[in-house]
């Protein structure tokens, strides 16, 4: 098995992940593993020397960087919050704060904005990933209602009057719950079924 550094006349290295091509010497050298950087470059006679990233810096991949990249905090002004701290092998992991969605994306989310309200009679369609996009409001399905303007309120099932030993006084709509009454209560005149002859 050939170990770096080794000559390569065709500009390609055997291990594309862990080696890189050094064109001036026409050799393949080792990259440094995640969490480290190049402290001494390779030569024809000596392979790359790597050192560990200092505190508050990182390199995520096999690399031949001569520095580690600085850890950056999640910017609360941009609506971001931290979900995992920076380590020598991974940058700070951020997400949108609750009630917000990602409005600007450049490899990762850079700016979050408030989710839009869903009007009464609708709810936000559930997404695979929280904070990925703005609300898409969909109507409450049959037998459900939602009576506020809110980014997060869910449609609730209409009350079943019979489950409480009551009878329906007014049917539920997409924006309001069923109204129930005691069976003994008399109906208001306009709802009475009595006909005068």
């Amino acid at each position: 098995q050939v170990v770096p550094p080794y000559g390569s006349e065709n500009q390609t290295c055997r291990d594309q992940e862990k080696e890189y091509y050094e064109p001036r010497h026409r050799i393949c050298c080792s990259r440094c593993p995640p969490g480290t950087y190049v402290s001494a470059k390779c030569s024809r006679s000596r392979d790359t020397v790597c050192a560990t990233c200092a505190e508050n810096s990182y390199n995520e991949h096999w690399n031949y960087l001569t520095i580690c990249q600085l850890c950056r905090p999640c910017d609360p002004v941009m609506g971001l919050e931290e979900i995992a701290p920076c380590t020598s092998k991974r940058k700070t992991q951020c997400r949108c704060q609750p009630g917000m969605f990602c409005a600007a994306w450049a490899l990762e989310c850079t700016h979050c904005e408030l989710l839009s309200d869903c009007p009464p009679g609708t709810e936000a369609e559930l997404k695979d990933e929280v904070g990925k996009g703005n609300n898409h409001c969909v109507p409450c399905k049959a037998g459900h209602f939602q009576n506020t303007s809110s980014p997060s309120a869910r449609c609730q099932p209409h009350t079943r009057c019979e489950d409480q030993g009551l009878v329906e006084a007014a049917p539920g709509t997409a924006q309001s719950d069923t109204t129930c009454r005691n069976p003994s209560e008399s109906l208001p005149p306009e709802m009475s079924g009595t006909m005068l002859m």
Partner: nanobody
């Protein structure tokens, strides 16, 4: 993945100039070293110029003082300005980029430069 497209090659008289471009597209992000190589008919591919991620440039002895490598990071493009061209500069010119901060090694398809009167 990353695609590289070279342009700017063609037929030019000795003493003339050409500017080659190499534009990267696709999932192109990160920190890169960029290179120009050339391959003359029946010869091995040879390194012409280097532009490192740190801003350093380097040239083959045969083109020093005549060729200039530059890059526009905002446009994901590397250039090769070739002046005082000679017949021996005739070759297919290839752009090559190597990602520094992560694995990644890519070639363009090449552009033909012919220097002839």
């Amino acid at each position: 993945d990353v695609q590289l497209v070279e342009s700017g090659g063609g037929l030019v008289q000795p003493g003339g100039s050409l500017r080659l471009s190499c534009a990267a597209s696709g999932r192109f992000f990160g920190i890169y070293d960029m290179y120009w190589y050339r391959q003359a008919p029946g010869k091995q591919r040879e390194l012409v110029a280097i532009s490192t991620s740190g801003g350093h440039t380097n040239y083959a002895d045969s083109v020093k003082g005549r060729f200039t490598i530059s890059r526009d990071n905002a446009k994901n493009t590397v250039y090769l300005q070739m002046n005082s061209l000679r017949p021996e500069d005739t070759a297919v010119y290839y752009c090559n980029i190597q990602r520094v901060d992560a694995p990644g090694f890519y070639w363009g398809q090449g552009t033909l430069v012919t220097v002839s009167s």
